[in-house]
């Protein structure tokens, strides 16, 4: 159905309230640095032109694209060429240019503090006295340090943060009830980020098709009594709503996104038996819900996969009528059966029965070629088998803390030319996948542990982008979506890396290190880690260990002191030099 | 059980457009596909299409895509074939068939239970 004007169409149906938190989160995402009140501003603007739209669609400029609509309203912006710089360059441009351009200037890594709240009583205060601005400062804090964030995932975790403060600023103990709840669900904001990053990674770089095959594996697993078509059904209307979330079409997707909520709802019979509950919330959590979902249970007579993709004798007739559908349905197959396999592996297996096909499909004797394509896949279901296997236990014995500074160590060996803060926080985030999955039981820890890999290297990968400095690193990144895991894991020490020159001030600690919060704490000590590793990055773990070991206590040592500034200044060049020895 | 009656197809240029229409009667269930082959004198079966009746998705084989279009009219119950584009190439005889939609080898004619009779389709240069 064509409508008249696009920006009536989206208001109506998304109602003013969402439609105008999507604002807020878009204009945030493309101008990360301006002012709330700013935003704010902006967005009231937008969203009383759409409501003057939806009354009288033929009213001036309501004709208009929302890309049009938007570009124009940023490029009022008055501090745009100070603040941005060459951003502002964009509007010179014409649509669809201008939107590729704001794009094109999103900034992964925009460096603005962690996000500190204030004291509850104060929170609670502001909750009560303006929710809406409330509400509009988190979506605003949270949508300009995560630019590529899940815009309708977002307009969900706002209502669960309103949530928490209704609840907790009626609690006797506000503290007590407010900590933990807004940890946890920074915890699945920060997931959530790093997850929808992954996935506008897939289709920026590796286009639709890599993102239909993870989407297929996915859902395939989640819904494995959907027939093919319905996932396919799923996969395509799902790859519309991400491909316009990731391109800053953020009514359009939230819009989209809760026409697959309602499609899957009315579909739940040839879908899911889980979905149910979901079915009955309302619109944010019933997408919400949908996404996250429980796995339903297998059909219980699946027939082997080697009938149709090895035994029947028209295999490569198949394959080359159709190539993207036969090979579609065998890892539509293949995922169903295989809950427990990370999507990764799953998109490994199918590549390599696809390169089989191509290369047994042009031999005499196809059959005999590809007769025993299933039983060569074992070293590829091996391989993460043993890395989780491996990484597991190493987990177990080490704690997280322990288990970061080993990634630490692997990885600022293998690519010791990336820069230290993305080093740290890269391995404290690989350091939680023990945390997160080894305590799963084994079904399901390959999964968890593997396709988390995957996120979490995509940070990496996202990082390096903006200033590259390691081949390695670029190789790794830009080969294969599929293979980056491995192709990290892969990585040997860097042969090739000239050792940093020593510099004493980067060793210089002060006694403001003793109040920093233990995860604080642990950065400092870890970002010494890496500095150390690049100054001598042949030191044995067992020298390193000693050296943490005496840093690790020359902190405790100085932090219990009375005089801790004098403390620090007095034995930190001491504790230099004695690693400088011990490291020779 | 399921009929199939087929209309359309003929004789046409290269280049030309041709649509083809396959109604179903009988007890149509749901969770079916209705699938499009062809066969040139002399080769095997070949799959050219299919459509889900439940939602619309298409699935084309690599020789046809781009070029022709799958429908469905439910109220009908017809699936249609729009050929676009035709080459000499695609001159067979076109078959409908009706099919479960849990199997998902959507490609191969031996997962379909009812067929249609076929109709010509004849493409000169």
């Known amino acids: 159905e064509a409508y008249k004007s696009e920006i009536a169409h989206r208001y109506n149906d998304l109602g003013e309230e969402h439609f105008r938190g999507l604002v807020l989160v878009a204009f945030s995402q493309y101008l990360q640095q301006c002012p709330f009140e700013d935003h704010v501003k902006l967005a009231k603007e937008v969203t009383e032109f759409a409501k003057a739209c939806a009354a009288e669609e033929s009213g001036a400029n309501c004709d208009k694209s929302l890309h049009t609509l938007f570009g124009d309203k940023l490029c009022t912006v008055a501090s745009l060429r100070d603040k941005y710089g060459d951003m502002a360059d964009c509007c010179e441009k014409q649509e669809p240019d201008r939107n590729e351009c704001f794009l094109a200037h999103k900034d992964d890594n925009p460096g603005f503090p962690p996000l500190v709240a204030p004291e509850p009583d104060a929170l609670c205060a502001a909750f009560q006295d303006n929710e809406q601005l409330f509400l509009g400062k988190y979506l605003y804090e949270i949508a300009r340090r995560h630019p590529y964030f899940y815009a309708p995932e977002l307009l969900y975790y706002a209502q669960q943060y309103k949530g928490v403060f209704a609840e907790c600023c009626q609690a006797a103990d506000k503290a007590a009830c407010l900590g933990p709840k807004i940890e946890a669900l920074r915890e699945k904001v920060l997931l959530s980020s790093a997850k929808e990053r992954f996935k506008c990674a897939s289709l920026q770089k590796f286009g639709d098709r890599a993102f239909k095959a993870w989407s297929v594996a996915r859902l395939s697993q989640r819904f494995p009594k959907a027939d093919f078509a319905e996932i396919s059904k799923v996969v395509t209307d799902l790859t519309k709503v991400h491909k316009e979330c990731c391109h800053g079409d953020l009514l359009e997707c939230a819009d989209d996104r809760a026409d697959l909520a309602k499609y899957m709802c009315e579909n739940q019979d040839s879908i899911s038996t889980k979905l149910k509950e979901c079915c009955d919330k309302p619109v944010l959590e019933k997408s919400q819900c949908l996404a996250e979902v429980e796995r339903d249970e297998l059909p219980g007579d699946l027939p082997s996969l080697a009938a149709d993709f090895v035994e029947d004798k028209e295999v490569c007739k198949n394959y080359q009528e159709a190539k993207d559908v036969f090979l579609g349905t065998f890892l539509y197959e293949y995922a169903r059966r295989h809950p427990e396999y990370s999507v990764s592996l799953l998109l490994r297996l199918a590549k390599e029965y696809e390169a089989t096909l191509e290369k047994c499909c042009a031999t005499d004797d196809p059959p005999t070629c590809y007769a025993k394509v299933l039983d060569e896949f074992k070293p590829l279901v091996d391989e993460p088998q043993n890395l989780v296997k491996t990484n597991c236990e190493l987990f177990e014995k080490l704690g997280e803390y322990g288990f970061q500074n080993a990634l630490l160590v692997r990885y600022t060996k293998k690519a010791p030319q990336v820069s230290t803060p993305t080093l740290v926080e890269v391995s404290r985030k690989l350091g939680k996948v023990g945390t997160k999955c080894c305590k799963k039981p084994e079904s399901e820890r390959m999964s968890c542990a593997e396709d988390f890999l995957s996120v979490v290297l995509n940070r990496l990968c996202v990082l390096h982008e903006k200033t590259p400095v390691s081949e390695r690193v670029t190789k790794c990144c830009s080969e294969s979506l599929v293979n980056r895991r491995p192709c990290f894991s892969g990585l040997e020490v860097d042969e090739t890396y000239v050792p940093k020159e020593f510099n004493a001030e980067t060793f210089t600690f002060h006694a403001d290190l003793c109040t920093l919060p233990e995860a604080e704490k642990q950065v400092k000590k870890q970002t010494a880690l890496v500095e150390l590793l690049k100054h001598k990055p042949k030191a044995t773990d067992e020298q390193l260990k000693t050296v943490m070991g005496d840093f690790g206590a020359f902190v405790e040592k100085c932090c219990a002191a009375e005089n801790k500034e004098g403390c620090f200044s007095e034995e930190g060049p001491k504790l230099v030099a004695a690693a400088q020895a011990a490291l020779v | 059980q399921v009929q199939l009656q087929q209309s359309g197809g003929g004789l046409v240029q290269a280049g030309g457009s041709l649509r083809l229409s396959c109604a179903a009667s009988g007890r149509f269930f749901s969770r079916q596909v209705m699938g499009w082959f062809r066969q040139a004198p002399g080769k095997d079966r070949e799959f050219v299409g299919v459509i889900s009746w439940d939602n619309g998705v298409t699935f084309y084989s690599d020789s046809v895509k781009g070029r022709f279009t799958m429908s469905r009219e439910i109220a009908k119950k017809t699936v249609h074939l729009q050929m676009n584009s035709l080459k000499p190439e695609d001159t067979a005889v076109y078959y409908c068939?009706?099919?479960?939609?849990?199997?998902?080898?959507?490609?191969?004619?031996?997962?379909?239970?009812?067929w249609g009779p076929g109709t010509q389709v004849t493409v000169s240069s």
């Open positions: 068939a009706a099919g479960n939609a849990l199997h998902s080898r959507y490609y191969s004619p031996s997962k379909y239970d009812y």
